[in-house]
Interface confidence: low
């Protein structure tokens, strides 16, 4: 008799793929633009990335550091009107993109939470949650919660409001903290909260260190759903050298949880390459005319247009990974097992029942390495075959689809491999 199929877990929409943050509408849309109507015109691009949700804003009225002049129910007229917002929601819905609204109150000011008037602000947030849920948003984000006194209890209350409206609504909290204990204490009292943090932000050093961070986090959070990013708002290039961007894209898309990216991560957008542009929100490079300040500063391979035409680009890799992440059961909700593969390497398996399985091997080092995959670290349910097919490499030059002998696996510097192999009874 055929073995019984494992029961599928309940999956929410944010379990099925990546979230895409657009914190700065003006920077995302570029010169002379920066409103909700313009963003609506970019939804096809978001669809092409196969992201499941758009984390937007903040876009509410906020006169910096002035609680009285901060209105979480009003859209700053610079961004557009409620009608524009409604139209954006409807268009996003048609394209199956959910919209999450950032309600970080004092986003233009010194302290995101007006430290001296916590209760007033908390009431405003509560009112705003009700208001925007009725308006049709799919969830909320609040950032810098380390600046919010009694954050855990407020988050629990806001989570109740959000989930009380519908189980299909999401609350994301962001913190600058990278401390696991602080992160766990925020998660403890808030079931289903998606938390973005700086936990992985210093992971770029070695494969061992990254493996240790990831496994510690997964062990500590148990079977709750995680999110993966390097910070609550900033670009990957703020933390990573260019040569590790592909590796991290592969890792973030294949770890168990929701990958969260900032606009521009898909093309390796780097503020440091654009003089005068703010680190946390450089202008999005749609094409070479997107940054006219310094002629010649932007080459085609830095832009969406240029990378769209190049199958070997970072953007093309992002699209492929996003596609795989959203349709393969083992990547959607499969079990995760990390195992030893040798110094400098981080490797793991994703598998779900009798579905196709995935092996990820990541070389964080700047020298080529032979992988010594220690299959003995794996449980019987996740055993390794002798060969696996190469689905993709982060580096050019490998023949995709070809079977690779796992005992003889060699990786280039900063190379990541995604291999697939069938379930074997």
């Amino acid at each position: 008799r055929a073995p019984r199929c494992r029961e599928l877990p309940a999956q929410k929409w944010w379990h099925t793929g990546a979230l895409y943050r657009i914190g700065d509408l003006q920077a995302f849309q570029g010169h002379g633009a920066g409103n909700l109507a313009g963003l609506k015109g970019r939804l096809d691009y978001l669809s092409s990335l196969k992201v499941k949700g758009l984390v937007l804003g903040p876009i509410h009225k906020n006169q910096k550091d002035d609680v009285a002049q901060t209105d979480l129910l009003q859209i700053d007229p610079n961004f557009g009107s409620k009608e524009d917002f409604d139209s954006l929601l409807q268009s996003a819905k048609k394209k199956s993109i959910r919209v999450i609204l950032d309600l970080t109150p004092n986003y233009r000011g010194e302290n995101s939470w007006f430290s001296t008037q916590v209760d007033t602000v908390a009431t405003k947030v509560k009112d705003a949650l009700e208001f925007w849920l009725q308006a049709g948003v799919d969830g909320f984000q609040v950032r810098d919660i380390e600046n919010l006194k009694d954050a855990s209890s407020f988050l629990a209350e806001w989570q109740n409001i959000t989930k009380g409206f519908s189980e299909d609504r999401l609350l994301i909290a962001g913190t600058n903290s990278s401390d696991l204990q602080q992160i766990l204490s925020l998660l403890e009292s808030n079931k289903d909260l998606l938390l973005t943090s700086s936990y992985l932000s210093d992971s770029g050093s070695t494969g061992e260190h990254t493996k240790s961070l990831v496994t510690q986090y997964l062990n500590a959070t148990g079977n709750r759903w995680c999110s993966w990013s390097l910070s609550q708002a900033r670009l990957l290039t703020s933390f990573l050298p260019a040569q590790l961007l592909r590796l991290y894209q592969l890792m973030l898309f294949t770890l168990p949880g929701t990958p969260v990216f900032s606009y521009g991560d898909e093309i390796g957008l780097d503020a440091a390459a654009l003089p005068g542009q703010p680190m946390e929100a450089p202008v999005m490079l749609w094409d070479e005319s997107s940054f006219p300040d310094i002629p010649g500063a932007v080459s085609a391979n830095m832009t969406v247009k240029g990378q769209s035409e190049d199958p070997g680009s970072l953007l093309s890799l992002f699209r492929r990974l996003s596609d795989q992440r959203s349709k393969e059961r083992s990547l959607l909700h499969g079990d995760f097992h990390a195992f030893s593969a040798g110094p400098g390497l981080f490797s793991y398996i994703r598998h779900w029942d009798q579905n196709e399985r995935f092996l990820v091997v990541l070389n964080f080092g700047d020298v080529g390495l032979s992988a010594g995959l220690q299959a003995s670290d794996l449980p019987a349910s996740a055993s390794l075959p002798a060969k696996a097919d190469l689905l993709l490499s982060t580096q050019p030059g490998r023949e995709e689809g070809s079977p690779l002998e796992l005992e003889r696996l060699k990786l280039e510097p900063h190379e990541g491999l995604l291999l697939r192999f069938p379930y074997a009874a």
């Epitope: 233009r108 503020a271 003089p275 005068g276 680190m279 929100a281």
Partner: antibody
């Protein structure tokens, strides 16, 4: 309350480099998306924007002074600095440091009290 | 970058209203709503009076108002008072991510 205070020599010889420092108190220079700027005012004349450094370290300068100006940030001391090379008597002015921002709040809300720099041999 | 153009001086009697103009180009005043106005008394640092064309910071009298049409911004002071006598400067952010100031206007209260 944020306060800015300029410091540096009041007298600089022609062809030398003018160096000024602005010390920021009441807030961290690296904590928000602010434009830390230098502005000068020639005696009896109007204000002239020299340049800014963003908290991330990015700089922008007045095109007419660009070849001679360097603005830098020292987050450990909560200071930012101005260097103006190859000075002449035309660089004699009151030099102000000021803050704009964050993000789209593109006006100067905090100013130092100004320091007079005279270029003379 | 050229300075914004302001009249060198304006004057008015107490209680009257005066308007100071500030003319720029399509790269600054016309392009953005990032026009600000500053008051400066002799020997003092400038003080922000108006930002984003027409907004007043807290503590600034409602007698001060700002507006813009095309590439010209204006500062109006109503109910002129003796303490309003000072130099006034306009400023704009520019499309080159720089700032530019006006030449300044000396306001005399007669």
């Amino acid at each position: 309350q944020v306060q800015l205070q300029e410091s540096g020599p009041g007298l600089v010889k022609p062809s030398q480099t003018l160096s000024l420092t602005c010390t920021v108190s009441g807030g961290s220079i690296s904590s928000g998306a602010y434009y830390w700027s230098w502005i000068r005012q020639h005696p009896g004349k109007g204000l002239e924007w020299i340049g800014y450094i963003y908290y991330s370290g990015s700089t922008y300068y007045n095109p007419s002074l660009k070849s001679r100006v360097t603005i830098s940030l020292d987050t450990s001391k909560n200071q930012f600095s101005l260097k103006l090379s190859s000075v002449t008597a035309a660089d004699t002015a009151v030099y102000y440091c000021a803050r704009a921002g964050p993000k789209w709040e593109l006006w100067f809300d905090y100013w130092g009290q100004g320091t007079l720099v005279t270029v003379s041999s | 970058q050229s300075a914004l153009t302001q009249p060198a001086s304006v004057s008015g009697s107490p209680g009257q209203s005066i308007t100071i103009s500030c003319t720029g180009t399509s790269s600054d005043v016309d392009n953005y709503n990032y026009v600000s106005w500053y008051l400066q008394h002799p020997g003092k640092a400038p003080k922000l009076m108006i930002y984003d064309v027409s907004n007043r910071p807290s503590g600034i009298s409602t007698r001060f108002s700002g507006s813009k049409s095309g590439n010209t911004a204006s500062l109006t002071i109503s109910g002129l008072q003796a303490e309003d006598e000072a130099d006034y400067y306009c400023s704009s952010f520019t499309s080159s991510s720089t700032w530019v100031f006006g030449g300044g206007t000396k306001l005399t209260v007669l």
